[in-house]
C-alpha cells in the first residue's frame, strides 16, 4: 500500500497472508467463511501457508494469530493465466477457524459498486515502488470508486466488467504484495486487489480490483459443492 | 508463439542520441499482464538493466543512466523504443529487449522472452 | 545501488558432475526477487529460475535455486553437454542490477 497508514489494531479480522517459504508473504487474501478464503486468482502457488489474525509483517508470534494450510485452490473458471479478468480463487482452509476479535469472516456484497463510493483497501504490500520496502504493521488506505468510464480511459482496451477502478490522490495506491486482499465498501467485501499501473501510485492511473458482485453466485456455489 | 526483435543502426557517433526499436510479434504491448524492458551487454562483460516501459507508458529506468535514457511506446505499431542521448565509447554494446511478467503480487517472473540482440558500436 | 558478486568467476567440471554458483548480495533482497539466467555464446540470456526456487517453462528438474537474504546458490544436479555457458543471477528488489557471471566450462 503506497501512502496508506497503519490500521488500527482489529479492524480487518478478515485479511488473511498468504505465505511462501516459510514466512515470505507473497498475496493476500480474505476470509470469507469459517473454512474459506478469497484470493487473486493470480496468486495460485502449489504450495503455501496462511496466516490469519496477525497485525505485523514478521513472523514473530502474535496471540490472536491462527495457522493454516490451503488444502484446495479453485481460481475461477474464466480466468487464464497471466490476464486479469475473472481474477479471483476460492482457497479451503485445512480446518475451520476459531472466531475472535482477530478472525472474522466478511460478507460479500452482492451490489456493485457505484462511482464515489468509499472504501478501505488493505495489505502488507510494498510501500514504495518501483523499489521495494515493506511495512512493519498492516497497512490501510482510503480510496473512491471511479466511474466505469474513468477506468476505462485510464487503461484502454484492457478493462472489463469482472473489474473496477479505484484511487485517490496521485501517490496513493495498492501495490506489489497487495494482490487478493480486500477493498472494503461500506462493511462489505467489494473487491480484491488485481492490478494496476506499473510502477503503482502513478497519477489518473488508479488501482484495479476485481469486481466481486459479479461473482456472489459462484462463490456461494463452489463454496457449497467443496464442503 | 511471442518474438522480440530489435532494429537500429549498427554504428552511433559519440556525443550523439543511439535510437532502437523492438517490435513484438506473436503477441501484444497493450497488456495489463507484461512490462517491457531494455538490456545491454558491453563486449565480453556482464548485463546491465536500462530500464522497463508499460503498455500506459509509465517508465523505470536504470539510476545511472536515467539522464540520458528515454523509452516509449507505440502500442498502435506494437512497439517500444530507447533512446540514448550524448553516448560514448563506453556505450558500446549489445542490446537487448525483454518481456516480464507483472501482477500485484509479491513476486518477480523474472524476463522471460528476449530478442536475439543487436550490436551497438560508438565510434567517429 | 545492490550489488551482485557472483562465485567462483569460472567454474570448470566434466559432464556427469555437479555445479553449484554462488551469488551473494551487498545488502539483503528478498528471495521472491532473485533470478537465474543462461546465456550462450552469440545468444540471449535465457531464464532459468525466478522467485529464488521456481523453474521457468521448459527448464530440466537438473537445474535447481535456492537461498535468501545474501547468499543465492544455483546447483546443477548433472552437467548434460549443454549446460556450459554463462550463468548470471538478477535482483528485483531494488533497481533490478545483475551479477557478474559465472563461466561454467568443459573441464
Known amino acids: 500500500i503506497i501512502n496508506g497508514s497503519d490500521c488500527d489494531m482489529h479492524t480487518q479480522p478478515w485479511q488473511a497472508a498468504l505465505l511462501l517459504r516459510p514466512n515470505q508473504l507473497y498475496c493476500g487474501a480474505v476470509l470469507v467463511h469459517p473454512q474459506w478464503l478469497l484470493t487473486a486468482a493470480h496468486c495460485r502457488k502449489k504450495v503455501f501457508r496462511v496466516r490469519l489474525g496477525h497485525y505485523s509483517l514478521s513472523p514473530v508470534y502474535e496471540s490472536g494469530q491462527q495457522m493454516f494450510q490451503g488444502v484446495k485452490s479453485i481460481p475461477h473458471p474464466g480466468y487464464s493465466h497471466p490476464g486479469h479478468s475473472n481474477d479471483l480463487m476460492l482457497i479451503k482452509l485445512n480446518r475451520r477457524i476459531r472466531p475472535t476479535k482477530d478472525v472474522r469472516p466478511i460478507n460479500v456484497s452482492s451490489h456493485c459498486p457505484s462511482a464515489g463510493t468509499k472504501c478501505l483497501v488493505s495489505g502488507w504490500g510494498t510501500t514504495k515502488s518501483p523499489q521495494v520496502h515493506f511495512p512493519k504493521v498492516l497497512q490501510c488506505l482510503n480510496i473512491s470508486v471511479l466511474s466505469q468510464k474513468r477506468c476505462e480511459d485510464a487503461y484502454p482496451r484492457q478493462i472489463d466488467d469482472t473489474m473496477f477502478c479505484a484511487g485517490d490522490k496521485a501517490g496513493r495506491d495498492s501495490c506489489q504484495g497487495d494482490s487478493g486482499g480486500p477493498v472494503v465498501c461500506n462493511g462489505s467485501l467489494q473487491g480484491l486487489v488485481s492490478w494496476g499501473d506499473y510502477p503503482c501510485a502513478r497519477p489518473n492511473r488508479p488501482g484495479v480490483y476485481t469486481n466481486l458482485c459479479k461473482f456472489t453466485k459462484w462463490i456461494q456455489e463452489t463454496i457449497q459443492a467443496n464442503s | 508463439q511471442l518474438q522480440l526483435q530489435e532494429s537500429g543502426p549498427g554504428l552511433v557517433k559519440p556525443s550523439e542520441t543511439l535510437s532502437l526499436t523492438c517490435t513484438v510479434s506473436g503477441g501484444s504491448i497493450p497488456s495489463s499482464s507484461y512490462y517491457w524492458s531494455w538490456i545491454r551487454q558491453p563486449p565480453g562483460k556482464g548485463l546491465e538493466w536500462i530500464g522497463n516501459i508499460y503498455y500506459s507508458g509509465s517508465t523505470y529506468y536504470n539510476p545511472s543512466l536515467k539522464s540520458r535514457v528515454t523509452i516509449s511506446v507505440d502500442t498502435s505499431k506494437n512497439q517500444f523504443s530507447l533512446k540514448l542521448s550524448s553516448v560514448t565509447a563506453a556505450d558500446t554494446a549489445v542490446y537487448y529487449c525483454?518481456?516480464?511478467?507483472?501482477?500485484?503480487?509479491?513476486?518477480?517472473?523474472?524476463?522471460?522472452?528476449w530478442g536475439q540482440g543487436t550490436t551497438v558500436t560508438v565510434s567517429s | 545501488e545492490i550489488v551482485l558478486t557472483q562465485s567462483p568467476g569460472t567454474l570448470s567440471l566434466s559432464p556427469g558432475e555437479r555445479a553449484t554458483l554462488s551469488c551473494r548480495a551487498s545488502q539483503s533482497v528478498s528471495s521472491s526477487y532473485l533470478a537465474w539466467y543462461q546465456q550462450k555464446p552469440g545468444q540471449a540470456p535465457r531464464l532459468l529460475i525466478y522467485?529464488?526456487?521456481s523453474r521457468a517453462t521448459g527448464i530440466p528438474d537438473r537445474f535447481s535455486g535456492s537461498g535468501s537474504g545474501t547468499d543465492f546458490t544455483l546447483t546443477i544436479s548433472r552437467l548434460e553437454p549443454e549446460d556450459f555457458a554463462v550463468y548470471y543471477c538478477q535482483q528485483a528488489f531494488s533497481s533490478p542490477t545483475f551479477g557478474g557471471g559465472t563461466k561454467v566450462e568443459i573441464k
Open positions: 522467485g529464488a526456487s
Open positions: 525483454a518481456r516480464g511478467e507483472y501482477d500485484r503480487s509479491y513476486y518477480y517472473w523474472g524476463l522471460d522472452v
